[in-house]
């Protein structure tokens, strides 16, 4: 299926040009999305192009500015947040990135009713996290690893925690591993629905081994960055959950929420917290061996001012074939009775589906079913449940939004997005207003992305929020590559692939092939989304065919494929890339003497192992910031898929699956190894060990390091990186410069 029909007519051909590397590096063909910042059922805020904060009322059709760009500029604000009582706005400036989600910033509070900044009892700086209560204008914030509370922005703060200490005790914010591998947020505190209580996590990293690396900077001596970072098998953070009454915070102080007995008996993780009502909270816990998860519903006991988590309100989710959940254990979406909930987990056939849990997990009512997967529950109202899945036309790499009517019996299902802009839009997400009165749909492709506003009752489109007209015009004279998404059936395994073909592709000719791989557990590379990126340029200008293949271990096609890699990382992911390459050669248009593979992070690991597979298929390849041994990576991620690196568990495969063990096999390939020296995620250690093993084996290779760059290799490093990789590939494929 050709997803991007060529608009080229012969008469136009001479005015069309190929993509250039400069186009990609300049972001010339980047797109915009529009996510409303909902503040009620029918109102949302949006930051205009000229930096005013504008309130839109869908029902009145009116909009007006609530905060001028002049006020924003006065404190160099780049972000804002309106208090739910509509009296104040926090303005965020001096953004300073820390890890993937975390950053510090300076915060100013602007009083909208009086048109001035709040003076007196100003916030300290820099703040690690700040948020309004869901009702009114209480503020919770984290400063120097401690949590503070303000009843009103101008009030003095009440200090909730006192034991916070850099790299030791984290209150209300996650440590490195919880941020990256468990919570995927910069915060670890949660207001109850009406702001009565504040729940927070405390992470104790006292006993965690520290990763230390040099940050060269500009000084005479480099700095040393120290991060408590548990690698596979190491001591993990100790987590505790507390809840404090924010109306009378000094009365009883923070109350700890008890951990379920079956979880507390050995090492465990806290995985998420969901408030149900002001006096009911749901916590999710996970054993360190991540195939058992417990969902615990706890109630406030007014008489004792404590939280009670009866065993009858514990729900166990266990996997017998792999780990619990997909990438993360799914979170519950509670219904209006405040006890039953909807949740995605594997059905008896091994497909992730929505289930309704009223009393026990064993008695769960399955809401969706089929040989496809439910991916996200967006919203549950009194009469509808909105979710996304890849059911439509059996393409796993699509996302459509569905509505199930739960108010009627039997429930009826409607695809909201399937036929809206069928050619242009096959991959959606959604954002709902209060009570799902209205919602925004954001379509990511395969055509040019478009964001639209819809009526929550009728699903009628109200207006286009962003259609990327400038991008559409800019692409009119560009020869974009053709893209197709198809599947291979090999030994009862379905391998979906995306092929990116040069604009004047001719099946009778031979083309160099570049495999782009990620391949990590529960990932998906073959998606029906729009992108004009480096590989688009390689196809458009340099005449390469690029292929992405989702092999075993990838997501949204059932547990058989997903859990195939359990305890065996680095085997089937590589095999499936190789199998796909052989199939591509059979198609007749690939020059089998010019095949390369490249990947980043997990993809760097897979590309390295593929190059060292001894098949002779690959002429060259690139690994950017690769994992080289699972003993070097984070405990939470690694052990989920590999178990522990101990003799009585899975040490043998930890040792067998390293890149270093295959150093000899790199002798007959051209290998480019790239890594940032300040990579907090996949440590430079990984590439240092590959390089050492190759040197010891006397194998020639190429390498590039990026000083003081992290896992993202951003800024000027990005330009250097893609220019360098382009030269390497062109040389490998004997393409003239």
């Amino acid at each position: 299926i050709v997803l991007r029909p060529s608009r080229v007519h012969n008469s136009e051909e001479n005015t069309m040009r190929a993509l250039t590397l400069k186009d990609i590096l300049n972001g010339t063909f980047s797109y915009k999305t529009f996510f409303p910042n909902w503040i009620s059922g029918q109102e949302y805020l949006h930051q205009s192009a000229d930096n005013n904060i504008v309130l839109y009322n869908i029902e009145t059709g009116q909009s007006y500015t609530i905060l001028s760009n002049r006020t924003m500029k006065s404190v160099n604000a780049s972000n804002y947040g309106l208090s739910p009582d509509r009296q104040f706005v926090y303005l965020e400036s001096d953004y300073s990135k820390l890890w993937r989600y975390s950053y510090t910033a300076t915060y100013y509070i602007y009083d909208l009713s009086n048109g001035e900044f709040v003076r007196g009892n100003e916030l300290p700086r820099p703040i690690q996290y700040l948020c309004w209560s869901p009702v009114g204008s209480k503020l919770a914030y984290v400063y120097q690893n401690n949590i503070y509370l303000k009843q009103r922005p101008g009030d003095p703060p009440f200090q909730i925690t006192f034991n916070g200490r850099e790299n030791k005790i984290f209150n209300g914010i996650p440590d490195w591993v919880y941020e990256e591998e468990m919570l995927a947020t910069k915060y670890a505190l949660w207001w109850s629905p009406n702001g009565k209580f504040l729940a927070y996590a405390e992470f104790n990293d006292t006993d965690i081994p520290v990763i230390a690396y040099s940050y060269y900077g500009d000084e005479q001596y480099p700095r040393t960055i120290n991060i408590p970072y548990p690698k596979a098998g190491a001591k993990n953070p100790v987590v505790r959950i507390f809840i404090i009454d924010t109306t009378y915070p000094a009365y009883v102080g923070p109350q700890e929420v008890p951990v379920p007995a079956m979880i507390a008996s050995s090492d465990y993780y806290f995985s998420w917290l969901t408030w149900v009502t002001d006096e009911r909270v749901c916590l999710q816990w996970l054993k360190r061996v991540q195939n058992v998860s417990v969902l615990s519903i706890c109630d406030f006991r007014e008489d004792w001012q404590t939280w009670d988590c009866p065993k009858t309100q514990e729900h166990i989710e266990e996997s017998r074939t792999g780990w619990a959940g997909g990438f993360f254990v799914s979170t519950p979406v509670f219904s209006y009775d405040a006890i039953s909930y909807y949740k995605i987990f594997s059905d008896k056939d091994g497909y992730k589906h929505i289930h309704y849990i009223k009393d026990t997990v064993e008695n769960a009512i399955q809401i969706t079913s089929g040989k496809w997967e439910a991916i996200n529950i967006f919203r549950v109202t009194q009469d509808s449940l909105f979710y996304s899945s890849n059911e439509f036309e059996e393409y796993p790499g699509r996302r459509n939004i569905y509505r199930i009517s739960i108010g009627s019996y039997p429930p009826s299902k409607k695809c909201v997005t399937c036929h809206l802009r069928k050619e242009r839009c096959q991959y959606y997400t959604a954002s709902f207003s209060d009570y799902a009165k209205y919602y925004a749909l954001v379509c990511y492709g395969p055509g040019i992305p478009i964001s639209t506003l819809h009526d929550g009752r009728t699903d009628q489109e109200i207006k286009i929020l962003e259609e990327n007209k400038e991008l559409e015009n800019a692409l009119k004279n560009i020869q974009l590559p053709k893209e197709e998404i198809k599947k291979l059936e090999v030994d009862e395994i379905t391998l979906w692939y995306k092929m990116i073909l040069p604009p004047q592709f001719d099946r009778s000719k031979k083309y160099p092939l570049l495999i782009q791989v990620y391949g990590g557990p529960c990932s998906q590379s073959v998606r029906s989304v729009f992108a004009v990126n480096w590989i688009s340029y390689l196809a458009s200008k340099e005449g390469m065919v690029i292929a992405l293949v989702d092999g075993r271990g990838t997501a949204f096609q059932g547990d058989k494929l997903l859990y195939a890699v359990y305890r065996k990382l680095g085997v089937y992911e590589v095999e499936d890339q190789i199998t796909a390459v052989r199939k591509f050669i059979e198609m007749g248009f690939i020059d089998e003497k010019r095949i390369a593979i490249w990947g980043w992070s997990y993809g760097g690991y897979v590309s390295s192992l593929a190059l060292a597979s001894g098949t002779g298929l690959f002429k060259c390849g690139i690994a950017v910031a690769p994992v080289s041994s699972w003993e070097y990576y984070a405990s939470v991620y690694t052990e989920r898929f590999m178990g522990l690196p101990t003799k009585d568990d899975n040490l043998e495969h930890y040792k067998n699956s390293t890149v270093m063990a295959r150093a000899e096999y790199f002798r007959n390939v051209d290998y480019l190894l790239i890594h940032g020296t300040a990579d907090d995620n996949v440590h430079f250690q990984n590439s240092a060990q590959i390089a050492k093993a190759l040197v010891n084996a006397q194998v020639d290779f190429q390498a590039m390091w990026y000083s003081d760059q992290n896992h993202g290799l951003s800024g000027l490093s990005t330009n250097h990186l893609y220019t360098h990789m382009t030269h390497f590939l062109k040389q490998c494929f004997s393409l003239s410069d």
Partner: nanobody, 117 residues
Framework: QVQLQESGGGLVQAGGSLRLSCAAS????????MGWYRQAPGKRRELVAF???????YYTDSVKGRFTISTENDKNTVYLQMNSLKPEDTAVYYC???????????WGQGTQVTVSS
């Protein structure tokens, strides 16, 4: 731009009631979320209550259960029914959009409410 005119204030004893009115130059429905604000002597103006076009309401903690905000769309009017008044409710009361606009809408004169003990 919207013109707003507040009325209905006065002197009342503690425990008494007042009903404030706010007349708008056009349909309340077309304006959007409307709020009642107040400013006590020497204090900053604060939002007391607001009402959205679908009649969801919000009240500041100190007036919950005593004040009621409502609209009469055909009369282009927003009301604030104030019961069980306390001396600390003494202030000039204003109506405006919630949050206020910076696009040139002006605050009205307000209406004085005085609660004696």
């Amino acid at each position: 731009q919207v013109q707003l005119q507040e009325s209905g204030g006065g002197l009342v004893q503690a425990g008494g009631s007042l009903r404030l009115s706010c007349a708008a130059s056009r349909s309340i429905f077309s304006i959007g979320t409307m709020g009642w604000y107040r400013q006590a002597p020497g204090k900053r103006r604060e939002l007391v209550a607001f009402i959205t076009v679908d009649h969801n309401t919000y009240y500041t903690d100190s007036v919950k259960g005593r004040f009621t905000i409502s609209t009469e769309n055909d009369k282009n009017t927003v009301y604030l029914q104030m019961n069980s008044l306390k001396p600390e409710d003494t202030a000039v009361y204003y109506c405006n959009r919630a949050p206020p606009s910076t696009d040139g809408d002006r605050w009205g004169q307000g209406t004085q409410v005085t609660v004696s003990s």
